[in-house]
Interface confidence: low
């Protein structure tokens, strides 16, 4: 009863404080009443507070289990190998940037930037992506030329539906080429990298949609969209992969104030998709061919398709006029890879089921940071690894395939008691020779328990020490796959383990 009375007092005092704030009472008065409230709360007792605390990660975040980490590292390995194969260097930047660095770079999405609480010093924000920090890095270091990759976590104050693989803290894997080069060669390489990675990951059939910001802007201009509405109409058009043209048109007309006939003109264009023939067709379009921007964009896309044919990936690319990626900083070619769900009916087109990689050209971003506005042309891509992790995890669960969470090659075990010293000596020899080895942390473990652990952990080999074997100078080596057991001379053990696990010679 005392506790209930105290809780009631806390509630009333809380209401009183809120009332004072609403009445805009003096800071001193509010502070005085807040102090009283804190004292009352303290009386409720710390133990009660502890019971109330629910142990969970913050909204939109998650822990990664060893199994999930194993999947993640495999995915990263595929991506990094590809980036390195294409000659990229690696950089890293701070998790937080000056708030000013991120301000005005993301358009409508700026609301989702995490600002850090001011500690009386600099105003800081958590990075929202890796592209803006990269542009800041280039401008700050006066770099005009670099091919780099960057894999790191970014933060978005979204309200995520985590069951759908959306988070507030998530990884991005970015590859970018900065520098003044001949048109479309770096852009084509970015698309090649995207296709290589998505093919290597074997997550299913995919399609890369390509468009150009200049074509979009030119198209809006010839259709009669006012300049001030380009960006907002862009965001409507970008929904076409999720909803019907009718719904997009209703949004443009009903909410964004576009004339119905203007919307219809846009509809004639944005519902088209195809290959290089569509590019050529649009170059002959009576209206578009009169727009300088659109013609430049279409000319570059024509060239891009030539390079994509040479790279052997043109069959994976679709020129799609409805692609209108949201970020404000894109200036030229834009692209987005979607996983395809195969059609249920014969003759239907494959259905896109969500973006798994995206990118484009952003020639103006670095100039935003340069005091003299000097531009560094850039083009890049971002792999949507969180989505890919989810897909790979689901696939593994469906196949019930066992995922190894360690790389241990051999378990050092003993067949009798009192052989801890021998196990420690042997495991140390193996570590020193660069072999990944483990032992159980018990003085006298039962052999059965050691073998059970070995099998459950999926360790390929077990080295068993016994008194007789010690006398004979051999170790019993058993393979989990074949169940065969052989006696190996102690001095040959390292070589034999290497041979059986295909490990090259290395030491730590």
């Amino acid at each position: 009863a005392d506790r209930a009375a105290l809780e009631e007092l806390v509630r009333l005092q809380g209401a009183h404080v809120r009332g004072l704030k609403e009445q805009k009472a003096s800071a001193e008065q509010i502070e005085e009443e807040v102090t009283k409230l804190l004292k009352l709360k303290a009386q409720l007792g710390q133990d009660e507070g502890k019971q109330k605390f629910v142990l969970k990660t913050p909204k939109g975040t998650r822990d990664y289990s060893p199994r999930q980490m194993a999947v993640r590292e495999k995915v990263f390995d595929v991506i990094i190998r590809c980036f390195k194969r294409h000659g990229a260097e690696v950089i890293d930047t701070p998790v937080f940037e000056l708030k000013e660095t991120l301000t005005g770079k993301y358009g409508e999405d700026s609301k989702l930037i995490y600002d850090l609480k001011d500690q009386g010093g600099e105003l800081l924000s958590l990075r929202y992506d890796l592209t803006v920090p990269f542009a800041r890095y280039l401008a700050m270091n006066k770099l005009t030329n670099i091919k780099r990759y960057h894999i790191a976590k970014v933060y978005r104050r979204d309200n995520p539906a985590m069951t759908r693989g959306r988070y507030r803290e998530f990884y991005q894997c970015d590859f970018d080429i900065a520098g003044q080069f001949d048109p479309m060669i770096p852009d084509a390489e970015c698309l090649k990298i995207m296709c290589e990675i998505l093919s290597s990951l074997q997550i299913g059939n995919f399609l890369v949609k390509v468009n150009d910001r200049r074509i979009l802007d030119g198209m809006f201009a010839v259709c009669g969209v006012p300049d001030s509405k380009f960006r907002t109409i862009c965001s409507s058009v970008d929904k076409l992969d999720k909803v019907s043209w009718e719904e997009v048109k209703n949004e443009m007309v009903g909410e964004k104030g576009l004339a119905p006939e203007v919307a219809d003109r846009i509809g004639d264009y944005v519902q088209q998709h195809g290959g290089v023939s569509l590019v050529e067709q649009l170059l002959q379009d009576p209206k578009l061919s009169q727009n300088k921007q659109a013609v430049e964009g279409l000319g570059d896309l024509k060239l891009l398709f030539e390079y994509l044919i040479l790279f052997g990936i043109d069959d994976k690319i679709s020129f799609d006029l409805s692609l209108a990626r949201g970020l404000d900083y894109y200036t030229g070619v834009i692209y987005e890879a979607v996983l395809l769900q195969m059609p249920t009916q014969a003759g239907e087109e494959p259905l896109g089921v969500g973006s798994i990689a995206a990118g484009g050209r952003y020639d103006g971003l670095v100039g935003m940071f340069d005091p003299k506005g000097r531009k560094v042309p850039c083009v890049g891509l971002s792999i949507g690894v969180e989505r890919i992790f989810s897909i790979v995890e689901q696939r593994l669960e469906a196949s019930e395939e066992k995922v190894r969470t360690t790389e241990t090659q051999v378990l050092v075990a003993s067949a009798q008691k009192k052989l801890l010293e021998e196990r420690l000596k042997l495991v140390s020899e193996l570590w020193d020779a660069g072999i990944k080895a483990e032992l159980l942390y018990k003085k006298n473990p039962k052999l059965l328990n050691q073998l059970q652990y070995w099998e459950e952990a999926g360790i390929p080999l077990v080295a068993i020490i016994g008194e007789q074997e010690l006398r004979d100078g051999v170790i019993k080596l058993r393979s989990v796959a074949s169940r065969e057991e052989v006696d190996v001379r102690r001095e040959d053990l390292v070589e034999e383990i290497r041979r059986r696990t295909n490990q090259p010679l290395s030491t730590c």
């Epitope: 995520p160 539906a161 985590m162 069951t163 959306r166 907002t232 965001s235 209703n250 009903g254 909410e255």
Partner: antibody, heavy 122, light 110 residues
Framework: QVQLVQSGAEVKKPGASVKVSCKAS????????IGWIRQAPGQGLEWMGD????????NDNEKFKDRATMTADTSTSTAYMELSSLRSEDTAVYYC???????????????WGQGTSVTVSS | DIVMTQSPDSLAVSLGERATINCQSQ?????????MHWYQQKPGQPPKLLIK???NLESGVPDRFSGSGSGTDFTLTISSLQAEDVATYYC?????????FGGGTKLEIK
């Protein structure tokens, strides 16, 4: 068809707790969040929070954070909302509702339970 | 929390006439977000979703209902009032936690 069926009316004394259940059928329970909304007599609607059974993740309205606990049992496709330290002003009809999702992340609630009347009186 | 101001509190409209209900959201400054939904509630019944995302009609809802607006100002319109439309109408935003509802507009027949 989608249905949310809630537990029956409750009469509680101040300081007690109440646990309202919401049994879902007609769809995959783990694919949608379940929100809890209350309506005091003659008053408007007040969102208390939601739970996404797919990962047991909850979004809370700070106002109820210390008193409302939302849980879900995927084996029975049932969501629960427990409200503790009841006071007379908690007298209301409590609704569960399914969080509809379109174009991403923000919820509209497309299917509602019939409501559970909770009366708090000494 | 985002405060939703619904107007008018009550409304009497003749059968066959147009009814318009407004909802203003505080704190959402960006002009292109449309995370606003409309519900109809009849006495003794749970609310029913009519319009989602400002203008998308929920399936099964008669097309005399329509929604418009973006940013901070939203409108629910019933083009030709029918007897069965007598109810209380609520707007709800889902821009940030916590979701909040407007105070409701009671619609009656004149």
């Amino acid at each position: 068809q989608v249905q949310l069926v809630q537990s029956g009316a409750e009469v509680k004394k101040p300081g007690a707790s109440v646990k309202v259940s919401c049994k879902a059928s007609g769809y995959t329970f783990t694919d949608y969040c379940i929100g809890w909304i209350r309506q005091a007599p003659g008053q408007g609607l007040e969102w208390m929070g939601d739970i996404c059974p797919g990962d047991a993740y909850t979004n809370d309205n700070e106002k109820f954070k210390d008193r409302a606990t939302m849980t879900a049992d995927t084996s029975t496709s049932t969501a629960y909302m427990e409200l503790s330290s009841l006071r007379s002003e908690d007298t209301a009809v409590y609704y569960c509702a399914r969080g509809e999702e379109q174009l991403g992340l923000r919820n509209a609630m497309d299917y509602w339970g019939q409501g559970t009347s909770v009366t708090v009186s000494s | 929390d985002i405060v939703m101001t619904q107007s008018p509190d009550s409304l009497a409209v003749s059968l066959g006439e147009r009814a318009t209900i407004n909802c203003q959201s505080q704190s959402v400054s960006t002009s292109t977000y449309n995370y606003m939904h409309w519900y109809q509630q009849k006495p003794g019944q749970p609310p029913k979703l009519l319009i989602k995302y400002a203008s998308n009609l929920e399936s099964g809802v008669p097309d005399r209902f329509s929604g418009s607006g973006s940013g901070t100002d939203f409108t629910l319109t019933i083009s030709s009032l029918q007897a069965e439309d007598v109810a209380t109408y609520y707007c709800q935003h889902s821009w940030e936690i916590p979701w909040t509802f407007g105070g409701g507009t009671k619609l009656e027949i004149k």
